[in-house]
């Protein structure tokens, strides 16, 4: 066990052009506070993943009012260290998030308003017991200067706070198998202390605070015999007595998650999903209120009305979960219509529309004939990514505004001559052909392929196409 300590030295405009505006004004005085979130390992964890190593919130800084016309100076800081206690071993490598929050002190309805000014994150290696490490991080136009260290709480010592030390019982030497505790040579390593309540018969530990079970026993304290009545979902070695596989203890057996947390197995261990108001590796840390800054990603915290709703996070768009810790896959709701491609930009959703569609959600069909006039008696036809007009005879073009040459397509077959006419075209057929397009040969016996020529027309006369 031990404590991670963070000392904020300054928060103000970074070097270079574009100095940020002061977050406070005479009309809206404000004060700063800081939140730190620690996670084990060097993995690139998302900002919304839980602070598995712990989190802490600073006190509020002095009230600050901007001097009119003055550039934003380094802002007045809260007193004291931010301290994040850790119960288990210090991991040596860790990720951190430090958030700078502004508390506005104007006459807001419902008390002070909070807003996130800057967030910095990083991954570091750090041995417990070492000196203060100094750091500078930039977030936009702001610069944060800070120092940090990890120190062990007695009786733990070592770079991971896993060795335990006790005062020597005898002045000359330590007990059998126990070494002196460097640098505290007057103390001796203590035997490992397993998790409180760990069964002395069926449990053992290799790290302090641990409780690992011998085969055939399970539960957080190794007090629950493994059932041999069922051979389903084997996990352990074969049992000679039952002839089937006895499940060895799984990480979630006996549910290590306290306070109603639900356990899920991970490749290396287990993960607890904690109910509102609890956090920590095993949901063992309780009594969280808004003062602890439990809302991630700029969520607004309001006090709940009972212990099971100790605080309520009102999440900004794009986040959900009781702590606003989960990023919403807003594209999973398929907001883009008509086959548009959804892009979640974090701060906003964007739809990339297919050809022929437009609008924030691709809801407007550009083929839509509404408001599209086809001239000269043409009719609008939807489709193909652009509206199309089916034009009346004698007209063409996209909107039927162009007068068409009906003879341009050479509609008269078999060498017939085409004449443009006010209501269409007329074909004058070559000898031996007849029909509106001169498409029918006249038979040598004088009968035509048509049953009869229309009254008043002799075969070979120009046929008017109506």
């Amino acid at each position: 066990a031990g404590v991670f300590e963070l000392q904020i030295h300054s928060f103000g405009p970074g070097p270079g052009p574009g100095a940020p505006r002061s977050p406070c004004s005479a009309r809206l005085p404000c004060r700063l506070f800081f939140r730190v979130c620690l996670k084990p390992g060097l993995s690139e964890e998302a900002a919304e993943s839980p602070c598995a190593l712990g989190a802490a919130l600073s006190a509020r800084g002095p009230v600050y009012t901007e001097q009119p016309g003055a550039p934003a100076p380094d802002l007045p800081l809260p007193d004291g260290l931010l301290q994040v206690p850790f119960r288990d071993a210090w991991p040596g490598t860790f990720s951190f998030i430090i958030e700078t929050w502004r508390e506005e002190l104007g006459d807001q309805i419902g008390g002070p308003a909070w807003s996130l000014l800057a967030r910095v994150a990083g991954r570091r290696r750090l041995a417990a017991g070492g000196p203060w490490a100094r750091d500078i991080q930039r977030a936009g136009a702001w610069e944060l200067r800070f120092s940090y260290r990890a120190r062990c709480e007695p009786p733990a010592v070592g770079t991971a706070c896993t060795r335990l030390c006790r005062p020597r019982s005898a002045p000359s030497r330590c007990g059998p198998g126990l070494r002196p505790c460097a640098p505290l040579e007057d103390e001796c390593e203590a035997p490992l202390v397993c998790r409180a309540g760990c069964s002395p018969e069926h449990g053992f530990c290799e790290q302090p605070g641990e409780c690992r079970c011998l085969e055939g026993w399970t539960g957080p304290l190794c007090t629950v015999p493994v059932s041999t009545s069922s051979c389903l979902s084997p996990r352990g070695p074969s049992s000679a007595t039952t002839g089937c596989l006895v499940p060895g203890p799984g990480p979630c057996d006996g549910n290590p998650c306290a306070n109603g947390g639900s356990c899920s197995e991970t490749p290396r261990s287990f993960e607890c999903t904690c109910p509102r108001g609890f956090y920590g590796l095993r949901c063992e840390v309780s009594g969280v209120t808004c003062a602890d800054g439990p809302c991630f990603n700029g969520g607004l915290c309001v006090g709940g009305a009972d212990p099971d709703s100790a605080y309520i996070c009102h999440c900004p768009p794009g986040f959900q979960g009781s702590n606003c810790e989960k990023r919403v896959d807003r594209c999973s709701l398929q907001p883009c219509r008509n086959g548009g491609l959804c892009l979640d930009l974090g701060h906003a959703l964007r739809c990339r529309c297919r050809a022929g569609f437009a609008g924030p959600r691709c809801e407007h069909d550009l083929d839509d004939c509404a408001g599209r006039a086809c001239a000269n008696g043409g009719t609008c036809v939807e489709g193909g990514g652009a509206h199309r007009c089916s034009c009346a005879l004698g007209f063409g073009g996209r909107d039927c505004r162009e007068r068409a040459d009906p003879c341009a397509a050479r509609p008269c077959a078999h060498g017939g001559r085409c004449y443009a006419h006010f209501s269409g075209l007329v074909c004058a057929c070559a000898p031996g052909y007849m029909g509106a397009r001169c498409e029918f040969p006249v038979h040598p016996d004088g009968a035509s392929a048509l049953p009869a020529a229309p009254p008043g027309l002799r075969p070979g006369d120009p046929q008017r196409y109506l």
């Epitope: 419902g110 008390g111 306070n259 109603g260 947390g261 639900s262 109910p275 009594g287 209120t289 808004c290 003062a291 309001v302 006090g303 709940g304 009305a305 009972d306 212990p307 099971d308 709703s309 100790a310 605080y311 309520i312």
Partner: antibody, heavy 117, light 109 residues
Framework: EVQLVETGGGLVQPKGSLKLSCAVS????????MNWVRQAPGKGLEWVAR??????????YYADSVKDRFTISRDDSQSMLYLQMNNLKIEDTAMYYC????????WGQGTLVTVSA | QAVVTQESALTTSPGETVTLTCRSS?????????ANWIQEKPDHLFTGLIG???NRAPGVPARFSGSLIGDKAALTITGAQTEDEAIYFC?????????FGGGTKLTVL
């Protein structure tokens, strides 16, 4: 809008039993702890019982005055809250309210229980 | 068992500011008591005003505010109106048990 509708009140003799129900709508019932609160005629409010949600193992809590006589329960699938009252006493006469605490307090309209010989 | 104490009655005038308080027998009221304020009007009409010490319910006028003053929870009505005449109960949570105060009868003359 959150709605809590209590039913099941009535006239009962001392040592008798009664079961109150509360139908809940317009919020995710399964997520929250639920409570019964009562108000005797001309008196103040008295908290009676509380039942937590499934992730808190449906733990129940009771006021000393009703312990071992009243049982609070819930049916998450129906969004229903219940109060089984046994061995009723004259001092249990009151208006009974189904109450839900979240960001503030939500009340039902109440159901009257009268214990009289 | 904790006892929660409120003023039995208070009188104010329209437009005045009045503060109702809620004291715990176990010591200072803290945010961990999730102080709640409830208004009762005739015919058993209850309205939750404030939850979690200072969280005003939607639809409740801005003149109602909750806070901690010293070692007590407080409900302040800034600019009381005649329609604010009612009985006000405070409730405090002690772990999973809820204890109500006896109520304050507020008269707005």
């Amino acid at each position: 809008e959150v709605q809590l509708v209590e039913t099941g009140g009535g006239l009962v003799q001392p040592k008798g039993s009664l079961k109150l129900s509360c139908a809940v709508s317009a919020f995710t019932f399964t997520t929250y702890a639920m409570n019964w609160v009562r108000q005797a005629p001309g008196k103040g409010l008295e908290w009676v019982a509380r039942i937590r949600n499934k992730s808190n193992n449906y733990h129940t809590y009771y006021a000393d005055s009703v312990k071992d006589r009243f049982t609070i329960s819930r049916d998450d699938s129906q969004s229903m809250l219940y109060l089984q009252m046994n061995n009723l006493k004259i001092e249990d006469t009151a208006m009974y309210y189904c109450v839900f605490y979240y960001d503030y307090v939500y009340w039902g309209q109440g159901t009257l229980v009268t214990v009289s010989a | 068992q904790a006892v929660v104490t409120q003023e039995s009655a208070l009188t104010t005038s329209p437009g005045e500011t009045v503060t109702l308080t809620c004291r715990s027998s176990t010591g200072a009221v803290t945010t961990s008591n999730y102080a709640n304020w409830i208004q009762e009007k005739p015919d058993h009409l209850f309205t939750g005003l404030i939850g979690g010490t200072n969280n005003r319910a939607p639809g409740v006028p801005a003149r109602f505010s909750g806070s901690l003053i010293g070692d007590k929870a407080a409900l302040t009505i800034t600019g009381a109106q005649t329609e604010d005449e009612a009985i006000y109960f405070c409730g405090l949570w002690y772990s999973n048990h809820l204890v109500f105060g006896g109520g304050t009868k507020l008269t707005v003359l």
